[in-house]
């Protein structure tokens, strides 16, 4: 039993670290392997993670961890029964993969714009809450060549989009992902897409009905 690609781990820096590795042959990860992890700190408990298969020889382990701090270092040991296959350390703050932004919605806004909004995946007290910047991908559902990428480097999880920059009458999808520059993180996974129809002439006809009541 041999490890082909040694474990690579990422932390969401709040509750979970995920390690992935590849064995040199197809392996029933949950039956044959265990990943033990222990905070490198006096009196810390040793924990065991039961890996799952992703592919026939790729194993993934999700480890619940406490709210991370920069000094945290975990000792990792990969076991096949009594045989130690690999040993290494993991510092969550150096391998951050942010959580996926949530609840992406699109709303008609004043001045012929669409307002895209989503939620920051971290509570305000977490280090990453104020560190995230975002990438928004907007694509035409029927034209793969028609797509735009927006970098949202300001704090608020919103993006204003001029309807005139998109084709009228076309269906568009948007998705968003996050990055923590200070931590030199990897990108988060993309959020689920949200889809809308882009009409901008005449704009008023395409506002949600409850907006019209304000004019009476």
């Amino acid at each position: 039993v041999k490890v082909l690609h040694e474990p690579s781990c990422f932390s969401d820096y709040i509750s979970t670290s995920v390690c992935q590795w590849k064995m040199d042959h197809p392996t029933n990860c949950s039956a044959e392997l265990r990943l033990s992890y222990q905070l490198d700190f006096m009196g810390s408990e040793n924990h065991t993670c039961v890996p799952e298969n992703r592919e026939d020889s790729v194993c993934v382990c999700s480890m619940p961890i406490d709210d991370a701090v920069e000094a945290d270092v975990y000792q990792l040991d990969l076991w096949a029964g009594q045989q130690l296959l690999w040993s290494g350390s993991f510092q969550p703050s150096k391998h951050v993969k942010p959580r996926t932004p949530g609840n992406l919605t699109v709303h008609p806004n004043i001045s012929h714009t669409w307002l895209l909004m989503w939620t920051n995946p971290y509570p305000t007290e977490n280090h990453l809450h104020s560190e995230l910047t975002y990438m928004v991908n907007v694509s035409n559902d029927n034209d793969p060549e028609d797509f735009k990428v927006y970098n949202v480097t300001y704090m608020g999880p919103t993006l204003r989009l001029a309807a005139s920059t998109l084709k009228s009458g076309a269906s568009y999808s948007a998705r968003v992902r996050a990055w923590a520059q200070t931590y030199n993180s990897t990108w988060s996974d993309w959020s689920p897409s949200t889809t809308w129809l882009n009409y901008y002439e005449p704009w008023e006809q395409h506002l949600p009905h409850h907006h019209h009541h304000h004019h009476h």
Partner: antibody
Framework: QVQLQQSGPELVKPGASVKLSCKAS????????IHWVKQRPGQGLEWIGW????????TYNEKFKAKATLTVDTSSTTAYMELHSLTSEDSAVYFC????????WGQGTTLTVSS | DIQMTQSSSYLSVSLGGRVTITCKAS??????LAWYQQKPGNAPRLLIS???SLETGVPSRFSGSGSGKDYTLSITSLQTEDAATYHC?????????FGGGTKVEIK
């Protein structure tokens, strides 16, 4: 020796469906994933998804979720990919391959979508 | 999705020369990178996996290097049979993705 033998070329009309096959031999079929890859003329490679023959579990590239359905028949050690609602964009060579990274490939099936 | 960018789509190199093909990932792929050689009408052939490990039967003039987001395939003392298209492939993150390919021609 490990072999992946794919079905022959297909010419189909827009809107139709087609089922491509990949017959595996020379190893225990249920042990390894089978992946499918698309290559349009003069273009790069696109990963469609994989199926794990032991339990039929699939993972798709989001882009192909509505386009492709992967299945296997363990009794004949054959993997299948059905492509739906075909358009000219689906005209390509489709390869099956065993387990990432892809050390074993089928010879490819050429699909032409034309009226 | 992780984008894989091969900076050159075409390279013309002298027989016996050296060629270097680069591949840049849009995010970390932790060395889960493979290189393939493909000749017209054929399926790709795996040359290198894990960024640096040469597959059995692949000549030693091929080598792979890199880490993080940046990877390189090198071919020294180029032979006529090395004329082909070379693809990089990340298999770290789903969906797996490929570079656009680099066609190597022998002068």
């Amino acid at each position: 020796q490990v072999q992946l033998q794919q079905s022959g070329p297909e010419l189909v009309k827009p809107g139709a469906s087609v089922k491509l096959s990949c017959k595996a031999s020379g190893y225990t079929f249920t042990t390894y994933d089978i992946h499918w890859v698309k290559q349009r003329p003069g273009q790069g490679l696109e990963w469609i998804g994989w199926i794990y023959p032991r339990d039929g579990r699939t993972t798709y590239n989001e882009k192909f979720k509505a386009k492709a359905t992967l299945t296997v028949d363990t009794s004949s050690t054959t993997a299948y990919m059905e492509l739906h609602s075909l358009t000219s964009e689906d005209s390509a060579v489709y390869f099956c391959a065993r387990s990432s990274p892809f050390g074993y490939w089928g010879q490819g099936t050429t699909l032409t979508v034309s009226s | 999705d992780i984008q894989m960018t091969q900076s050159s789509s075409y390279l013309s190199v002298s027989l016996g020369g050296r060629v270097t093909i680069t591949c840049k990932a849009s995010d970390h792929i932790n060395n889960w990178l493979a290189w393939y050689q493909q000749k017209p009408g054929n399926a790709p052939r795996l040359l290198i996996s894990g960024a640096t490990s040469l597959e059995t039967g692949v000549p030693s003039r091929f080598s792979g290097s890199g880490s993080g987001k940046d990877y390189t395939l090198s071919i020294t003392s180029l032979q006529t049979e090395d004329a082909a298209t070379y693809h990089c492939h990340q298999y770290w993150s789903i969906p797996y993705t490929f570079g656009g390919g680099t066609k190597v021609e022998i002068k």
